[in-house]
């Protein structure tokens, strides 16, 4: 967190608190998380440490769910203290506030190994796709606090961290929505998210990431009671994430191909596509689901993965050279990722210094492209569109300040790949 | 410390050859760029180029690409820049000049002390 | 190649006085712009660089401004060190130019 002047306040989850202020942090998908304790230090920093829980004498304790720790049954506070929560509505059925349940059909871009785990939180339910552990054995069951089956004597205290762990301010709540768009899935080894594991419906305690754990990425997508999707648009009956893109379908015209339509949080932006004016060819020609004329038998340089026609257009879209240069001495790594246009003709880099897995250092630089000519080490790593550029930056503004005050190992190698287009199916992009 | 030393003056004839040496040390030499500066007297600095140390590519200016030679010698940590067919106008202060690690974009963190070339008849 | 012109080419002014140099490129170099300081006989020294960074173990007083086309320095409060000539240097394309230089003398 940046101090702010002279009247020194923190900044979480864009709300202000003054110094030495206390409070449990609200982390999506798990809601008010009553087993961590924030303090605004002096210096404008934000300190979360894990609540210790004493030891508990008898032998039934009661988990009472707006407090950490487990009580005895004759220490409870009465029941006029009783915080009472919302409860939540979705398909038909209502959840209790804590309570986690399974939800189908969210995220179109769900891999086999991964479930979409959905809590209810003061009245919000929020859900995220959570990416399951490989499985050891051959008959797994299922457990109330995951969408993940386990198998037998798994999953109970290895979600649990140890106590009193001190972590940094975790990223503001969009910084876990955004760069894991619908056009990739890390693969389940990283660990992309803000967040691993759902903890128990009962207990809050092991909600926060710890580096060293395997587990999956967490993106979230928050819905109402109203079934509205936070950060999906629907056209047509199609669910779309945000930053996807799509060609209308018009009821009157079937699919067009020449509007081209993006999901931006939860409005729907279409933007009309326009062809070139002048083709490196005498006769191009018109070809059923491509919107512009492409040149005949004349294929561009591919690259793994990508199409791209004559001009280097992908989905309508221009597309920009993306080159990426790893630099690394002396524990630190400077990771350089530039774009370069034509209008106007010249590079931008991105520069990224990570030391022990610790942002130090980052800012953008425009140099010419004759200046970028001069330097070594960049080398092609793909080709983009201007509208995955802003989804890379935008994620990459999120995670510059969530990766200067925690551990982050491959979120910045995992957002390079919002850049990677995807070979467009035949007809539709 | 990061220093840059470099040879001492030296006094040249129309026509010859001069080349200027500048040690690095406190850092890896191999790891950022050396540049060459010059200053005429009363003047104002001019960049000659640039030599990668790691591999000993160059970038020269346009106005001296034909008349400088830089090169490097890992082993000594040691980076050179030669100008030949000296003329009059050539009698300049040379630096070299380091340019920081995490920007693309040039900025000489640290100098050479100068060495001063004159030529004259 | 890109011009560099900086204003005034000398100043005269006193300890304690805030001093401004401008300088002005002749096309838009974004933040690819640096300012040193030179003392005679000695090496330039960098102050700023990407317009408006401080390099590291320069006083604060020193600070830069400004994006595109006009940038300026700034010396809140002149100190008797600080009388010497400054540079203003386009790093945002190759051949690598610099101002003329301003003379700042005291008053």
């Known amino acids: 967190e940046q101090v702010k002047h002279s009247e020194t306040y923190c900044m979480f989850q864009d709300k202000k608190y003054r110094v030495g202020e206390r409070w449990h942090p609200y982390l999506e998908p798990y809601g008010l998380v009553y087993c961590v304790n924030c303090i605004c230090s002096e210096n404008g920093n934000v300190l979360c440490s894990r609540v210790r829980c004493p030891n508990v004498h008898c032998l039934s304790p009661v988990h009472i769910p707006h407090l950490c720790c487990p009580r005895c049954p004759d220490s409870l506070p009465p029941v006029n203290n009783k915080v009472t929560s919302k409860s939540c509505e979705y398909n038909g059925t209502t959840y209790q506030h804590g309570e986690l349940f399974v939800a189908e059909g969210l995220f179109q871009n769900r891999q086999p190994n991964q479930c979409t785990q959905c809590s209810c939180s003061e009245g919000n339910v929020y859900c995220g796709l959570k990416t399951c552990p490989k499985l050891t054995c051959a008959f797994p069951v299922s457990v109330p606090d995951s969408c993940c089956r386990v198998c037998r004597g798994d999953g109970e205290l290895s979600w649990e961290h140890s106590d009193g762990d001190i972590f940094r301010q975790p990223a503001n709540r969009e910084a876990r929505h955004s760069y894991h768009r619908s056009h990739y899935d890390p693969p389940p080894s990283r660990q992309a998210g803000g967040l691993s594991r759902f903890p128990g419906a009962r207990s809050h305690r092991g909600a926060l990431m710890d580096s060293q754990q395997a587990s999956g990425t967490i993106v979230q997508i928050v819905i109402n009671n109203k079934h509205k999707h936070g950060q999906v648009c629907v056209s047509n009956g199609k669910t779309y994430s945000h930053g996807e893109s799509w060609h209308p379908n018009l009821r009157a015209f079937g699919i067009v191909e020449c509007v081209l339509c993006t999901c931006n949080v939860t409005k729907q932006e279409c933007k009309k596509i326009h062809c070139p004016n002048r083709y490196p060819c005498k006769y191009p020609q018109k070809i059923d689901g491509k919107c512009c004329k492409v040149c005949p038998g004349k294929k561009a340089k591919e690259l793994p993965g990508q199409s791209f026609d004559n001009k280097g257009y992908f989905c309508g879209e221009e597309t920009m050279p993306v080159y990426e240069s790893v630099f690394m001495e002396d524990g630190e790594t400077t990771r350089k990722i530039a774009l370069e246009t034509e209008r106007p003709p010249q590079v931008e880099v991105h520069v990224w210094t990570i030391r022990k897995g610790i942002l130090q250092h980052f800012h953008i630089e425009k140099i010419s492209k004759r200046m970028f000519e001069e330097l070594p080490h960049f080398k092609l790593v793909t080709r983009t569109t201007l509208s995955q550029w802003k989804i890379f930056t935008e994620g990459e503004a999120q995670i510059s300040q969530m990766c200067s005050s925690r551990v982050c190992r491959t979120e910045l190698e995992d957002l390079v790949k919002v850049l990677y287009l995807e070979r467009s199916e035949k007809g539709h992009c | 410390q990061v220093q840059l030393v470099q040879s001492g003056a030296e006094v040249k004839k129309p026509g010859a050859s001069v080349k200027v040496s500048c040690k690095a040390s406190?850092?890896?030499?191999?790891?950022?760029?050396m540049h060459w500066v010059r200053q005429a007297p009363g003047q104002g600095l001019e960049r000659m180029g640039n030599?990668?140390?790691?591999?000993?590519?160059?970038n020269y200016n346009e106005k001296f690409k034909s008349r400088v030679t830089m090169t490097v010698d890992k082993s000594s940590s040691t980076a050179y820049m030669e100008l030949s067919s000296l003329r009059s106008e050539d009698t300049a202060v040379y630096y070299c000049a380091r340019s920081k690690n995490n920007y693309v974009a040039y900025y000489f963190d640290y100098w050479g002390q100068g060495t001063l070339v004159t030529v004259s008849s | 190649d890109i011009q560099m012109t900086q204003s005034p080419s000398s100043l005269s002014a006193s300890v304690g006085d805030r001093v401004t140099i401008t300088c002005r490129a002749s096309e838009n170099i974004y933040y690819s712009l640096a300012w040193y300081q030179q003392k005679p006989g000695k090496a330039p020294k960098l102050l700023i660089y990407?317009?408006?960074s401080l390099e590291d173990g320069v006083p604060s007083r020193f600070s830069g401004s400004g994006s595109g086309t006009d940038f300026t320095l700034t010396i809140s409060s002149l100190q008797p060190e600080d009388f010497a000539t400054y540079y203003c240097k386009q790093a945002y394309d190759v051949p690598l130019t610099f101002g003329q230089g301003t003379k700042l003398e005291i008053k």
């Open positions: 030599i990668n140390p790691s591999n000993g590519g160059t």
């Open positions: 406190g850092y890896t030499f191999t790891s950022y760029w």
């Open positions: 990407n317009a408006n």
